[in-house]
C-alpha cells in the first residue's frame, strides 16, 4: 500500500486512509502505538482502504504502520506519524452566584496539562482571560456586573496544544430590565419559557404590550407578529384590523402594523420566518426588518437573507402595505382583493402569509413562493422578530 | 454610471472550452444576482443561467446544464462563464446582465455582448 | 418550463399609430412579466417590469397591463426611434424565459 494519511483527529480518534496496494491483496495488517501506550494490532479485509482507530490517549503522538499479506506474502511498511488532540476539561459549572461573584468549577482532562485558559465574557462584550494552574479545578470570579448574563469558557493547555472550549452560562442576580421592550429583554431578564409576556415600548411602563414570546428557535427571545395554523382566524381584514392587529395571541393572529412600527423604530431588528408542513421545515431570516409609520403606509425594509426557505421576501421590500380597502401596491389590480388578504404587495406576491388558510389555488392561499410555490397553502406560519445584535447573545438564556 | 463589459468571446471548436468575463462597476455588485443571456445569430433571447448576489445559489438552462458553470468573485466586480463541450448551437452573442434590486430575475442593466462562434 | 407566446410576429406601423402587442404564458404568473426593446446591433433595454411599471427613464408613450397569463405593451404614438424589436420575458420561475419577438418596422 502507499499514501498512508489520517484524517478526523479527535482527542481520542483518528481514521486512518491508504492507497491499495497495486496487486490484489488478502489482508491488511495495522499496528499503532505511542508513548506509554502499548501496541495495537489490527487486522483488516485486503479490499479495505480506511480503519478507525479508536480509545486512543488525548495529546500522544502515535505512530501508525502498516504493510500488505497475501498468503505468506508481506509487502514492505509504511509509516505515518500523528498526534491526538488534547482533551477538554469536563463539567464546567458556575455556583455561588451571587450580585458580582460566581464559582466556576470543573473537572480535569485525561491528559496531562500545564494549565487552564479561563475566558468569562459579559453580554456588554467584556471580556476577561485568566490563565491558571495545572492543579486547579476552581476559580473564583469577582467584580462582576449584577444583573448580567455571562459565557465563561476554559480551555486545557499543554505547551503548544489547546483542547476544545467548553462552556457554561450564568446570570447574576438582579433584574436587567424592569420594563422589557422586547422579548429578547424578556429573555435577559431570566424568562426563558415561550409563551405571552407584556413588554413596553420604549422601555415606558404607560406603553404596556401583551406579546408572544417564542424563547426557543434560534436562541429565542423573538416577538412574534404572525401566526397561521388552523385557519380558525378571519386575515381578509380592512386596514384599520391590519393597523391595530387582531386574533388571539396564543393562536392565530395579527400583531398590528403599528406595534410594529413602534417596535422595530426602538432599535435594529431581524426577522425570522418559520413555516411547517407535513412534517418538513424551512425558515428565513432577514438582519434588518422594519416598518414605516402610517404615513409611508407602513413600508417595509428587509434585507440580508439567509435561512432554507428560500428569499421570497426580497420581492416586497420597500413596498407599502395593502389591503383590500387600501390600495398601495404596483399592480393594476388591488392584490388584496384579487388574493384575498393582506401583505406588502407588488405586483402581486411571492410571500402570501396572510392569504387564506388552505386554499390551493395560485396564489390565494399561505404561500411561501420560493418554498411551496403557489400552489400549496403552507400549515404552519410564524413571522417574528427581535434585535439584530441578539446572535451575539446567543444560548446566554442557559442556566449554569 | 453602471455598465458591464463582457470579454472573452471569440472561434472555438466543438467540444473545446471558452471562459466568459463580465467587469461591473457603477453599482454595489455583491446586492445584485447577475445572469447570461444569449441571442443566436437572427433569432430570440433566451436566459442561460444566474447566480445570486452571494454567489451561494446557481441556475442553469437545461440545454448547458453539466456543461456550463457560472461564478463570480465579488472582490473583483466579475462575473464568469466557463464554457465546457462546446456545441454547434452554442454559437450566439453571450450577454451579461444585471438582476433587479429585489426580483433578480429581472434583468434592468445589460452589457454590450461577446460573440462566441462554435465552429470546426 | 413556462412558455411565453408572443404576436404578431411582425407589425409594419406607420409614425404616430398606436401599437399594442400581446404576451401569453402558458402558465399562471400572476404580474412577473417583463419587456425589453432590441434595437439592431444592440443590447436589449429594459422597458416595463412587473406588467405594468415603467422603467426609470422610459417614455411615458410606453404602457404595460395585464396579469395571470394574457399581458399588453402598448406604444400609445409610435415614434421614429420605437422601431425595434419587442420581447416578454417571464420573471416568476426559472428558468426564465422570453417571448420569440415581435418587430416593429415602418410600415
Known amino acids: 500500500p502507499s499514501g498512508l494519511v489520517t484524517a478526523n483527529i479527535t482527542d481520542s480518534e483518528a481514521l486512518a486512509r491508504w492507497q491499495p496496494a497495486i496487486a490484489t491483496v488478502d489482508s491488511y495488517v495495522i499496528s499503532y502505538t505511542g508513548e506509554k501506550v502499548p501496541e495495537i494490532t489490527r487486522t483488516v479485509s485486503g479490499n479495505t482502504v480506511e480503519y478507525a482507530l479508536t480509545d486512543l490517549e488525548p495529546a500522544t503522538e502515535y505512530t501508525l504502520r502498516i504493510f500488505a499479506e497475501k498468503g505468506p506474502q508481506k509487502s514492505s511498511t509504511i509509516t505515518a506519524k500523528f498526534t491526538t488532540d488534547l482533551d477538554s476539561p469536563r463539567d464546567l459549572t458556575a455556583t455561588e452566584v451571587q450580585s458580582e461573584t460566581a464559582l466556576l468549577t470543573w473537572r480535569p482532562p485525561r491528559a496531562s496539562v500545564t494549565g487552564y485558559l479561563l475566558v468569562y465574557e459579559s453580554v456588554d462584550g467584556t471580556v476577561k482571560e485568566v490563565i491558571v494552574g495545572p492543579d486547579t479545578t476552581s476559580y473564583s470570579l469577582a467584580d462582576l456586573s449584577p444583573s448580567t448574563h455571562y459565557t465563561a469558557k476554559i480551555q486545557a493547555l499543554n505547551g503548544p496544544l489547546r483542547s476544545n472550549m467548553i462552556q457554561t452560562i450564568f446570570t447574576t442576580i438582579g433584574l436587567l430590565y424592569p420594563f422589557p421592550k422586547d422579548c429578547s429583554q424578556a429573555m435577559l431578564n431570566g424568562d426563558t419559557t415561550s409563551g405571552l409576556y407584556t413588554i413596553y415600548l420604549n422601555g415606558d411602563k404607560a406603553e404596556a404590550l401583551e406579546v408572544f414570546c417564542d424563547m426557543t428557535s434560534d436562541g429565542g427571545g423573538w416577538i412574534v407578529f404572525l401566526r397561521r395554523k388552523n385557519g380558525r382566524e378571519n386575515f381578509y381584514q380592512n386596514w384599520k384590523a391590519y393597523a391595530a392587529g387582531f386574533g388571539d395571541r396564543r393562536e392565530e393572529f395579527w400583531l398590528g402594523l403599528d406595534n410594529l412600527n413602534k417596535i422595530t423604530a426602538q432599535g435594529q431588528y431581524e426577522l425570522r420566518v418559520d413555516l411547517r408542513d407535513h412534517g418538513e421545515t424551512a425558515f428565513a431570516v432577514y438582519d434588518k426588518f422594519s416598518v414605516g409609520d402610517a404615513k409611508t403606509r407602513y413600508k417595509l425594509k428587509v434585507e440580508g437573507y439567509s435561512g432554507t426557505a428560500g428569499d421570497s421576501m426580497a420581492y416586497h421590500n420597500g413596498r407599502s402595505f395593502s389591503t383590500f380597502d387600501k390600495d398601495t401596491d404596483s399592480a393594476i389590480t388591488n392584490c388584496a382583493l384579487s388574493y384575498k388578504g393582506a401583505f406588502w404587495y407588488r405586483n402581486c406576491h411571492r410571500v402570501n402569509l396572510m392569504g387564506r388558510y388552505g386554499d390551493n389555488n395560485h396564489s390565494q392561499g399561505v404561500n411561501w413562493f420560493h418554498w411551496k410555490g403557489h400552489e400549496h397553502s403552507i400549515q404552519f406560519a410564524e413571522m417574528k422578530l427581535r434585535p439584530s445584535n441578539f446572535r451575539n447573545l446567543e444560548g446566554r438564556r442557559k442556566r449554569a | 454610471q453602471v455598465q458591464l463589459v463582457e470579454s472573452g468571446g471569440g472561434l472555438v471548436q466543438p467540444g473545446r472550452s471558452l471562459r466568459l468575463s463580465c467587469a461591473a462597476s457603477g453599482f454595489t455588485f455583491d446586492d445584485y444576482a447577475m445572469h447570461w443571456v444569449r441571442q443566436a445569430p437572427g433569432k430570440g433571447l433566451e436566459w442561460v443561467s444566474g447566480i445570486s448576489g452571494s454567489g451561494g445559489s446557481t441556475y442553469y438552462a437545461d440545454s448547458v446544464k453539466g456543461r456550463f458553470t457560472i461564478s463570480r468573485d465579488n472582490a473583483k466586480n466579475s462575473l464568469y462563464l466557463q464554457m465546457n463541450s462546446l456545441r454547434a448551437e452554442d454559437t450566439a452573442l453571450y450577454y451579461c446582465?444585471?438582476?433587479?434590486?429585489?426580483?433578480?430575475?429581472?434583468?434592468?442593466?445589460w452589457g454590450q455582448g461577446t460573440m462566441v462562434t462554435v465552429s470546426s | 418550463d413556462i412558455q411565453m407566446t408572443q404576436s404578431p410576429a411582425s407589425l409594419p406601423t406607420p409614425v404616430g399609430d398606436r401599437v399594442t402587442i400581446t404576451c401569453r404564458a402558458s402558465q399562471y404568473i400572476q404580474g412577473f412579466l417583463n419587456w425589453y426593446q432590441q434595437k439592431p446591433g444592440k443590447a436589449p433595454k429594459l422597458l416595463i417590469y412587473?406588467?405594468?411599471n415603467l422603467e426609470t427613464g422610459v417614455p411615458s408613450r410606453f404602457s404595460g397591463s395585464g396579469s395571470g397569463t394574457d399581458f399588453t405593451l402598448t406604444i400609445s404614438s409610435l415614434q421614429p426611434e420605437d422601431f425595434a424589436t419587442y420581447y416578454c420575458?417571464?420573471?416568476?420561475?426559472?428558468?426564465?424565459?422570453f417571448g420569440q419577438g415581435t418587430k416593429v418596422d415602418i410600415k
Open positions: 420575458q417571464q420573471s416568476y420561475s426559472t428558468p426564465q424565459t
Open positions: 446582465a444585471k438582476g433587479q434590486k429585489g426580483e433578480g430575475d429581472t434583468f434592468d442593466i
Open positions: 412587473d406588467a405594468s
